[in-house]
């Protein structure tokens, strides 16, 4: 009886055990007992990324311009083509189907991780002795002024979204 | 360790037979076609015949046909060349291999040979 | 029969050279060929199957090319071990059939 599976890298068709073809070509005709499988190489703008029975190449993926897109990565016979986003943007998926600009951080908020061409600004909260008093996509938060450190002592507390206000010090004699 | 032995070479004389054998061991050796593939002295490699896993698809090379027979026997684990009516021409290193594919004795590659066994057909 | 045709029959390198040896076939075999390895007194051994995927622990300096009628075996960095001769064959179509093999010597 004929095998009911083949190996790695084959298909069982007419109880014969048949080579998929190798990425970067398609299935022209199945094999038999004295051809080998027929394949043919994919065509500039498509590919197959896998040993495959596929009788159709893939299209390449298009980086629409008008989605914000650009090319990353030419696609070859074996692989698509990576799209990434423009400067100022980054991809709404995965699959980078289309760009959104980057976040800001509000105030009070600062840059935890500058945004990529796939992923968006991160904002964490400033903590207590920094601030951020604009909104921005790379600017982190800062630390309060030390009044100290300048012979001054503090006037008006700092906070989240604003700076200490440092003055002179009283000079009263005791 | 994965390996296929052959035997059964040696001196003979033309119009006289020959039966080489091959011993496998390592792998299952009814899961592949097998063939026998020689080499003359000084020369390339000639495929000779192929055998499919379940000896239903059995092969030979234009030179051989009629004169040589390919045979199998999965519980000996064992590959079997019968050489009738040898001829001067047929004097070369005779090797056992194994195909990684399982369902055609007709074509294939070879990711596993034997050391081989020479068989001299001489008067 | 589908004729393979090596060229050259031989090549003379050195240790570090860069090796090119090529196959060409009568009629189109997409990517169905495979290279050995064979030395003096020795099996043939495999090395590249489907024309470019290296067999399982042969070492990364071999490489092959090629699709339709025309291949390439490579060398990238000769080494001692590496003088040898070496078959290509067609598994494309009944019979299976071998090049004329290229000796690779010291030079």
């Known amino acids: 009886e004929p095998p009911t599976a083949c190996r790695e890298k084959q298909y069982l068709i007419n109880s014969q055990c048949c080579s998929l073809c190798q990425p970067g070509q398609k299935l022209v005709s199945d094999c038999t007992e004295f051809t080998e499988t027929e394949c043919l190489p994919c065509s500039e703008s498509e590919f197959l990324d896998t040993w495959n029975r596929e009788t159709r190449c893939h299209q390449h993926k298009y980086c629409d311009p008008n989605l914000g897109l650009q090319v990353q990565q030419k696609g070859t016979s074996e692989t698509d083509t990576i799209c990434t986003c423009e400067e100022g943007l980054h991809c709404t998926s995965e699959s980078c189907e289309s760009c959104v600009p980057h976040r800001s951080c509000l105030p009070g908020f600062g840059v935890k991780q500058i945004a990529t061409g796939v992923s968006d600004t991160i904002c964490e909260p400033c903590p207590v002795g920094f601030f951020s008093n604009v909104s921005s996509a790379f600017e982190k938060c800062r630390p309060w002024t030390s009044c100290e450190t300048k012979d001054l002592v503090v006037q008006q507390a700092g906070t989240n979204k604003t700076d200490v206000v440092c003055g002179p010090q009283d000079r009263q004699r005791a | 360790e994965v390996q296929l032995v052959e035997s059964g070479g040696g001196l003979v004389q033309p119009g006289r037979s020959l039966r080489l054998s091959c011993a496998a061991s390592?792998?299952?050796?009814?899961?592949?076609?097998m063939h026998w593939v020689r080499q003359a002295p000084g020369k390339g490699l000639e495929w000779v015949s192929g055998?499919?896993?379940?000896?239903?698809?059995?092969h030979y090379a234009d030179s051989v046909k009629g004169r040589f027979t390919i045979s199998r026997d999965n519980a000996k684990n064992s590959l079997y060349l019968q050489m009738n009516s040898l001829r001067a021409e047929d004097t070369a290193v005779y090797y056992c291999?194994?195909?990684?594919?399982?369902?055609?004795?007709?074509?294939?590659?070879?990711?596993?040979w034997g050391r081989g066994t020479l068989v001299t057909v001489s008067s | 029969d589908i004729q393979m045709t090596q060229s050259p029959s031989s090549v003379s390198a050195s240790v570090g050279d860069r090796v090119t040896i090529t196959c060409r076939a009568s009629?189109?075999?997409?990517?169905?060929l495979a290279w050995y390895q064979q030395k003096p007194g020795k099996a043939p051994k495999l090395l590249i199957y489907?024309?470019?995927y290296l067999e399982s622990g042969v070492p990364s300096r071999f490489s092959g090319s090629g699709s339709g009628t025309d291949f390439t075996l490579t060398i990238s960095s000769l080494q001692p071990e590496d003088f040898a001769t070496y078959y290509c064959?067609?598994?494309?179509?009944?019979?299976?059939?071998f090049g004329g093999g290229t000796k690779v010597e010291i030079k």
């Open positions: 291999a194994k195909d990684p594919t399982a369902t055609t004795g007709a074509r294939g590659y070879f990711d596993l």
């Open positions: 390592g792998f299952t050796f009814d899961d592949y076609a």
């Open positions: 055998i499919s896993w379940s000896s239903d698809s059995i």
């Open positions: 009629k189109v075999i997409s990517s169905w």
């Open positions: 489907a024309a470019s």
């Open positions: 064959q067609q598994h494309s179509s009944f019979p299976p059939t």
